[in-house]
Amino acid sequence: APVPPGEDSKDVAAPHRQPLTSSERIDKQIRYILDGISALRKETCNKSNMCESSKEALAENNLNLPKMAEKDGCFQSGFNEETCLVKIITGLLEFEVYLEYLQNRFESSEEQARAVQMSTKVLIQFLQKKAKNLDAITTPDPTTNASLLTKLQAQNQWLQDMTTHLILRSFKEFLQSSLRALRQM
């Protein structure tokens, strides 16, 4: 499994380095998760031809993956720090059920999948500390999540492979947009 941010050899070798600021720590955490996603995508793409498939729409109908839109206040035009932060945290909370689904989907990268899931939980905690308006953040309903998980796991093999690919791709895109937005804060 990859080494969590702040524990890589560079940090150990340079104890005189200034401690990371809150935004640098969040940035590093997202980068770490993105590296993990990259490794998981490699396994998915090597194992099946999902990454080149044109039938994504079929599987996408079953999913309601969080997406960033203009109204969320995360883009440069119409940027709104508080609205955007709420969107990022809410989106990450919504992704958690999909990250849970990924846990049994990898053979050689099982630890990596767990690391992505755990690091996302840590990222949510970092961001919640940053948010002023925690009341505006809606937490997904556990019962709804449980039934969604059951439904996803009951899909045929092809749809499960496609779902895995779509979750990884969407999560990567959501994190990259979040990274960009958080740097404006």
Epitope: F75, Q76, S177, R183
Partner: antibody, heavy 120, light 106 residues
């Protein structure tokens, strides 16, 4: 072969408009960050704008904000730079480029550039 | 915009010299900085990314260091091919460049 070809440059009067095109080949713009950089004659490089492939989110330099618009046409694998209210200081060679996508943070593919001259 | 201030603007040196170019960001950019070399009439070519990582195929005489707001590019022993203009660029937010450093023969 990965390539970017700009077109649409030329002579325009102050206050006028111009639309630059950048045709990409060898990769898809729908899954890459794209960027416009300009260089005035004998001067340094200036970042103008970039377009993040996800949701088409754009980001602009203060010097062009409100006047320039970056967009794309995925079906044509082409990005555009619509330049309005042009000023003499916008005279430059405009390069279309691609941000290296996997998080290393640099430009890995450049076009050859197209010259825009703003003069009366 | 994040402002990038590069110095010196011109540097005169001889083959074999060790030279250092500095770049300062107006706000913290972590390690999101790249160095480019540009020759007349050509598009820039990346030398260093993430402040200190050497791009593949770039000679090891080039090195980069720094983090936060202060960065340096060092050429340990100048070669004839190194006389060119060098730019730093941040990729923390947007992609602003430094003004450039023209490295010329003394």
């Amino acid at each position: 072969e990965v390539q970017l070809v700009e077109s649409g440059g030329g002579l325009v009067q102050p206050g006028g408009s111009l639309r630059l095109s950048c045709a990409a080949s060898g990769f898809t713009i729908s899954s890459n960050y794209m960027i416009w950089v300009r260089q005035a004659p004998g001067k340094g490089l200036e970042w103008v704008s970039d377009l993040y492939y996800y949701a088409g989110d754009t980001y602009y330099a203060d010097s062009v904000k409100g006047r320039f618009t970056m967009s794309r046409d995925i079906s044509k694998n082409t990005v555009y730079l619509q330049m309005n209210s042009l000023r003499a200081e916008d005279t430059a060679v405009y390069y279309c480029a691609r941000w290296e996508e996997e998080g290393r943070g640099y430009i890995d593919v450049w076009g050859r550039g197209t010259l825009v001259t703003v003069s009366s | 915009d994040i402002q990038m201030t590069q110095s010196p603007s011109t540097l005169s040196a001889s083959v074999g010299d060790r030279v250092t170019i500095t770049c300062r960001a107006s706000q913290g950019i972590s390690s999101w900085l790249a160095w480019y070399q540009q020759k007349p009439g050509k598009a820039p070519k990346v030398l260093i990314y993430k402040a200190s990582t050497l791009e593949s195929g770039v000679p090891s005489r080039f090195s980069g260091s720094g983090s936060g707001t202060e960065f340096t590019l060092t050429i340990s022993s100048l070669q004839p091919d190194d006389f060119a203009t060098y730019y730093c660029q941040q990729s923390w937010l947007g992609g602003s460049f430094g003004q450039g450093t023209k490295l010329e023969i003394k």
